[in-house]
């Protein structure tokens, strides 16, 4: 990640469109995180990002539990929170943000999904009063197209993030497919 | 400077295992993921499994279930077995580093080591 | 799987020639292609990552291009020590595959 004190600021929310009509129950299930980009996200020049999966689960109050499995330390870490519904379909805010020490803004919009293969997702948070912001692309299976990820490439750039803030993750054998 | 050596048995009889050792100096073997690839003789070059920095692995889909990856940092070697081998698995082994992040390139290799599975 | 094929599997050329290698993918693998050199005594060396750019201390008169489907490795001013076999690999799509080879050989 990119420790640096200058950080690409986060793009106006105009920029970012937002999934019409979007269907909640649909979005459901297990997604990998086939691409990610973001302010402080950095191609390193050695071993890539590894791939992680996330789970949005439905409950009955429309919030979303969210869990992201991802290998670290040599074992499988879980890392579990909970999206609420915001202003509009498609847009949510994080559930008990007080109990994330320096965090004081944070916000999810699904930019465009087809629910079944792919998605991409924007976040934004403000964390000891800096803003940071990420896109992620999702699909169902490990592998999407050399056209999604193309796209993905150009709505990241369109946002402000050069090419070496936009990584593929590299699937792995462990946790993801648990 | 940068260094693979690969260390094998040669000769590995129908339906047993083959172990493989590379041994890498120059680098440690907690920044860069090692892969394993192979070229059995007249065909294209084959890759097999790689061990990442962190411990993950990234294996061929259509060999997992006969590959297994390990290694010790500590030691710098990163140990590769093979189950179940047959003639067609006669090939030249190779280990070799990875670099370039998701541009999944491998910037050093090993000289290979020769395995032929015969009775 | 992705098959890349490399349809001159020897060329044979003089020195100080400009030669160029093809390497084609089965589908489109966005630039996602390395380039490789494999000398007669067996070692293997990286040359290019990522279609163009060159791995450190690869000399300039190597160079890569394409897109898509398509890719092309270059050689201007061909060496005496640049008689190897070149080969290609596809980082887009697991598994990651090679292509055959292409063997320069001295007229």
């Known amino acids: 990640q990119d420790s640096t004190s200058d950080l690409i600021p986060a793009p106006p929310l105009s920029k970012v469109p937002l999934q019409q009509n979007f269907q909640d129950n649909q979005f459901q299930g297990k997604w990998y995180v086939v691409g990610l980009a973001g302010n402080a996200i950095l191609r390193e020049d050695k071993d890539p990002q590894k791939m992680y999966a996330t789970i949005y689960e439905l409950k009955e109050d429309k919030s979303y539990n969210v869990t992201s499995v991802l290998f670290r330390k040599k074992k499988c870490d879980y890392w579990i929170r909970t999206f609420v519904p915001g202003c509009q379909p498609g847009e949510f805010t994080l559930g008990n943000i007080k109990s994330y020490p320096g965090l004081t803004s944070y916000l999810v919009r699904v930019v465009s999904t087809n629910y079944n293969q792919h998605a991409m997702v924007f976040f934004k948070k403000v964390s000891q009063n800096r803003e940071y912001f990420k896109i992620t692309l999702y699909g169902r299976t490990k592998e999407l197209t050399s056209e999604l990820k193309e796209n993905f490439i150009r709505f990241s750039k369109s946002l402000g993030l050069p090419e070496n803030h936009i990584v593929f993750p590299v699937p792995i054998d462990q946790c993801i497919d648990g | 400077e940068v260094k693979l050596q690969e260390s094998g048995p040669g000769l590995v009889a129908p339906s047993q295992s083959l172990s493989i050792t590379c041994t890498i100096s120059?680098?440690?073997?907690?920044?860069?993921?090692i892969h394993w690839l192979r070229q059995p003789p007249g065909k294209d070059l084959e890759w097999l499994v790689v061990?990442?920095?962190?411990?993950?692995?990234t294996s061929n889909s259509a060999l997992k279930s006969r590959l297994s990856i390990s290694k010790d940092n500590s030691k710098s070697q990163v140990f590769f077995k093979m189950s179940g081998l047959q003639t067609d698995d006669t090939a030249i082994y190779y280990c070799?580093?990875?670099?370039?992040?998701?541009?999944?390139?491998?910037?050093?290799w090993g000289p290979g080591t020769s395995v032929t599975v015969s009775s | 799987d992705i098959v890349l094929t490399q349809t001159t599997s020897s060329l044979s050329v003089s020195l100080g020639d400009r030669v160029t290698i093809n390497c084609r993918a089965s589908?489109?693998?966005?630039?996602?292609l390395n380039w490789y050199q494999e000398k007669p005594d067996g070692t293997v060396k990286l040359l290019i990552y990522?279609?163009?750019r060159l791995h450190s201390g690869v000399p300039s008169r190597f160079s890569g291009s394409g897109s898509g489907t398509d890719y092309s490795l270059t050689i201007t001013n061909l060496e005496q020590e640049d008689i190897a076999t070149y080969f290609c690999?596809?980082?887009?799509?697991?598994?990651?595959?090679f292509g055959g080879g292409t063997k320069l050989e001295i007229k």
């Open positions: 120059g680098f440690s073997l907690t920044s860069y993921g």
């Open positions: 061990i990442w920095g962190d411990g993950s692995t």
């Open positions: 690999q596809q980082g887009n799509t697991l598994p990651w595959t």
């Open positions: 990522f279609t163009s």
């Open positions: 070799a580093r990875h670099r370039y992040s998701d541009y999944h390139a491998m910037d050093y």
């Open positions: 589908q489109d693998i966005s630039n996602y």
